[in-house]
Amino acid sequence: DFGLDCDEHSTESRCCRYPLTVDFEAFGWDWIIAPKRYKANYCSGECEFVFLQKYPHTHLVHQANPRGSAGPCCTPTKMSPINMLYFNGKEQIIYGKIPAMVVDRCGCS
Amino acid sequence: DFGLDCDEHSTESRCCRYPLTVDFEAFGWDWIIAPKRYKANYCSGECEFVFLQKYPHTHLVHQANPRGSAGPCCTPTKMSPINMLYFNGKEQIIYGKIPAMVVDRCGCS
């Protein structure tokens, strides 16, 4: 498994992982104590046939070509959690590992 | 976690799982001994904001709205394997659990 990494200067048109820092403060999400911001990343780009396909299923659906199947799109194929300290809405402060907050890899699915 | 299930008669426009039988014989894939066909399913439909979003990350990227982020797309969010008996191309027959061959649930990611 591998995926492309790009940045704002890249000319890559294919499915790629781009850097993105999420700033909770800028969103006005003041119930999050920490972190104030974190590197979330995101996926963007085109999914040509077979390029970076995560699943054999994606190829099979393309072969079968059913009505309404739009072809694969560029989406996270590997994600990881971050630890957060936050108010849970019941006047409690919680420390927890929140899953799927960081995109580690992008692919066509 | 939940997802919508549809069929060919559905009028649902949102992200949904549709039935699809993959027929290896129709593809000419004669290296596959068994199964000859299986129920693979596929995902199709629109991903309006927040509908069936699998990850909090999807919502955060929408909030941050970086250049080139296309918004979520309808994609498998839960998949399962099938057991296959096949020629591996080296005159050997192999039985293996092939991951991510069946779509169990669709969502916006």
Partner: antibody, heavy 116, light 107 residues
Framework: EVQLLESGGGLVQPGGSLRLSCAAS????????MSWVRQAPGKGLEWVST????????SYPDSVKGRFTISRDNSKNTLYLQMNSLRAEDTAVYYC?????????WGQGTLVTVSS | DIQMTQSPSSLSASVGDRVTITCRAS??????LNWYQQKPGKAPKLLIY???SLQSGVPSRFSGSGSGTDFTLTISSLQPEDFATYYC?????????FGGGTKVEIK
């Protein structure tokens, strides 16, 4: 009803050749892999070969590799086993079988005797 | 090569008995295990495939279980027509191999 009928067995001298046939009916022959299995007199079962549905892929155990060749003619619904350089230990009843996850239908077999 | 060891090699039982035959693989074979019945002078007949799936047309008194290396064929209530030799076979990888057989005889 699935039917498999083997033919071509008989008495052959060591070093000789024989070609077995298996005529298939009652199913779409071209859709399924096929196998040959043999059974020496009073002994257990031994896999001999398998061929893919289209005939592109084959597999053999070391005991027959290089001497036996499996083939098929989908237009005639027939499976073949060409046996060369035959040895006394090849004496057995040879069965053809329709191959799925398992060998789900078998013919009645044809006896091959290798003896001088 | 994967060796398949069946036990017992033979057993005597009466009509109505519950009979259990075991098959052990020399390495893990997942659920790629099949069971066949063979009567004298006849071709083998598939009973169970993929360890526990009953082949179409086979009576429900036959059942299979197990995964990995240890497998079992059970006949819940032995019938007169069940006296035969039973073979296990792995389809996990080539060479495809059979167990040595278990002969079920009338007590």
């Amino acid at each position: 009803e699935v039917q498999l009928l083997e033919s071509g067995g008989g008495l052959v001298q060591p070093g000789g050749s024989l070609r077995l046939s298996c005529a298939a009916s009652g199913f779409t022959f071209s859709s399924y892999a096929m196998s040959w299995v043999r059974q020496a007199p009073g002994k257990g079962l031994e896999w001999v070969s398998t061929i893919s549905s289209g005939g592109s892929y084959t597999s053999y155990p070391d005991s027959v590799k290089g001497r036996f060749t499996i083939s098929r003619d989908n237009s005639k619904n027939t499976l073949y086993l060409q046996m060369n350089s035959l040895r006394a230990e090849d004496t057995a009843v040879y069965y053809c079988a329709k191959q799925d996850y398992a060998m789900n239908y078998w013919g009645q077999g044809t006896l091959v005797t290798v003896s001088s | 090569d994967i060796q398949m060891t069946q036990s017992p090699s033979s057993l005597s039982a009466s009509v109505g008995d519950r009979v259990t035959i075991t098959c052990r693989a020399s390495q893990s074979i997942s659920t790629a295990l099949n069971w066949y019945q063979q009567k004298p002078g006849k071709a083998p007949k598939l009973l169970i495939y993929s360890a526990s799936s009953l082949q179409s047309g086979v009576p429900s008194r036959f059942s299979g279980s197990g995964s990995g290396t240890d497998f079992t064929l059970t006949i819940s209530s032995l019938q007169p027509e069940d006296f035969a030799t039973y073979y296990c076979q792995q389809s996990y990888s080539t060479p495809l191999t059979f167990g040595g057989g278990t002969k079920v005889e009338i007590k």
